[in-house]
């Protein structure tokens, strides 16, 4: 014959541990059932009767099977440099996460507690590494033959167009200037250019294929800077 | 907490070579250029020139080429400055700022290494 | 290389006098200016960034303006504290100092 199943509130055979979805009280040493989530416990067990659970109150949740007294807050609205990923629901907690153009400097078990604006790379450097939901950008001097003319989260150092004759050479901050209306090639279009190891921009060590290559890499005017994002630090 | 700490003090002969550093805590050492300025006595701060420890690449004002070289080490995050063929004018203090490429060159400095030549 | 013009080279306030010091730079830098107090045996701090973002932590009577080549930094309420040298730096091309500003109290 099968075993009886016990009903909700029994008392456990010695040794043996309460059933999926039950706890052990320890006032009426029974298994009693547990809340579901989106509910707590109103009443508590007793060696007589079940626990009595009651649904969240608004602004509050339970996102486990539980025997809480009273449902978790939600935390507080999403600050401006933050969007609701997860609202607040009688079960799950409110997510915030960073808005586009901002990182999380300081996280929390889900979501974000701090939000930082994501580090603009100025005229003369760029973007090394991009940022992502928990790292800023890291920003690097443009290489020789590279330049950056803008201030950017997201752009990297392209490579200086290369002219038949040179008008004005390109550095780091500025693409070269060819007298021609067309240069004769430019690198490939998109083409990622990092900083490169031990390069030594003021003693114009870059190779110099071409004499046309513009010689001088170091910084000059950058072409229409933005200003720094609201909140920013500078880190 | 950020800080940049230089080693001590340093008395050169003329005609010597000097080499001070800067050892980084409190961030990543190798996501900022370190700089280096030179402030004479009693005098105004004159730019050097930086290091990206990443990579070892290095840019110099025109006046500092011959004589400052900037290398940095990853393995103990110190950068330096080694000054060569000293006279009297290169007596001065020597400070490292770091620069992390955006709005804010040089927001954290060295205490500063004054370097004496004397014969 | 771009040229920084400071003056004047010394100031002497009263308590809570107002006090200006400019910078002219010998090309358009671009709002890439920054501003430093350095006090007597101490390095350098950064007060403000690209010409008016005031650093955390840089009281409020400090500010900055400018554009273009003309630049400008004020201490509103002149306090005792203040009493130190101030240095603007381009960071635009390559980097320049200016010559610097002594601020004394009368």
């Known amino acids: 014959l099968p075993a009886q199943v016990a009903f909700t509130p029994y008392a456990p055979e010695p040794g043996s541990t309460c059933r999926l979805r039950e706890y052990y009280d320890q006032t009426a040493q029974m298994c009693c059932s547990k809340c579901s989530p989106g509910q707590h416990a109103k009443v508590f067990c007793t060696k007589t009767s079940d626990t009595v659970c009651d649904s969240c109150e608004d602004s509050t949740y339970t996102q486990l099977w539980n025997w809480v007294p009273e449902c978790l807050s939600c935390g507080s609205r999403c600050s401006s440099d933050q969007v609701e990923t997860q609202a607040c629901t009688r079960e799950q907690n409110r997510i915030c996460t960073c808005r586009p153009g901002w990182y999380c400097a300081l996280s929390k078990q889900e979501g974000c507690r701090l939000c930082a604006p994501l580090r603009k790379c100025r005229p003369g450097f760029g973007v090394a590494r991009p940022g992502t939901e928990t790292s800023d950008v890291v920003c690097k001097p443009c290489a020789p033959g590279t330049f950056s003319n803008t201030t950017s989260s997201t752009d990297i150092c392209r490579p200086h167009q290369i002219c038949n004759v040179v008008a004005i050479p390109g550095n780091a901050s500025m693409d070269a200037v060819c007298t021609s209306t067309s240069p004769t090639r430019s690198m490939a279009p998109g083409a990622v250019h990092l900083p490169q190891p031990v390069s030594t921009r003021s003693q114009h060590t870059q190779p110099t294929p071409e004499p046309s290559t513009a010689p001088s890499t170091s910084f000059l005017l950058p072409m229409g800077p933005s200003p720094p994002a609201e909140g920013s630090t500078g880190d | 907490e950020v800080q940049l700490q230089q080693s001590g003090p340093e008395v050169g002969r003329p005609g010597s070579s000097v080499k001070i550093s800067c050892k980084a805590s409190g961030y990543t050492f190798t996501d900022y250029i370190m700089h280096w300025v030179k402030q004479s006595p009693g005098q105004g701060l004159e730019w050097i020139g930086w290091?990206?420890?990443?990579?070892?690449?290095?840019d110099y004002a025109e006046k500092f080429k011959k004589k400052a070289t900037l290398t940095a080490d990853t393995s103990s995050n110190t950068a330096y400055i080694q000054l060569s063929s000293l006279t009297s004018e290169d007596t001065a203090t020597y400070f490292c700022?770091?620069?992390?490429?955006?709005?804010?060159?040089?927001?954290?400095w060295g205490q500063g290494v004054m370097v004496t030549v004397s014969s | 290389d771009i040229q920084m013009t400071q003056s004047p080279p010394s100031l002497s306030a009263s308590l809570g006098d107002k006090v200006t010091i400019t910078c002219q730079a010998s090309q358009n830098i671009n709002k890439y200016i920054a501003w430093y107090q350095q006090k007597p045996g101490k390095a350098p701090r950064l007060l403000i960034r690209?010409?008016?973002t005031l650093e955390s932590g840089t009281p409020s009577r400090f500010s900055g303006s400018g554009s273009g080549r003309d630049y400008s930094f004020s201490i509103s309420n002149v306090e005792s504290e203040d009493i130190a040298s101030y240095y603007c730096l381009q960071y635009v091309n390559l980097l320049t100092f200016g010559a610097g500003t002594k601020l004394e109290i009368k």
């Open positions: 290091v990206d420890p990443e990579y070892g690449s290095t």
């Open positions: 690209y010409t008016s």
């Open positions: 700022a770091r620069d992390d490429g955006s709005y804010s060159p040089f927001d954290y």
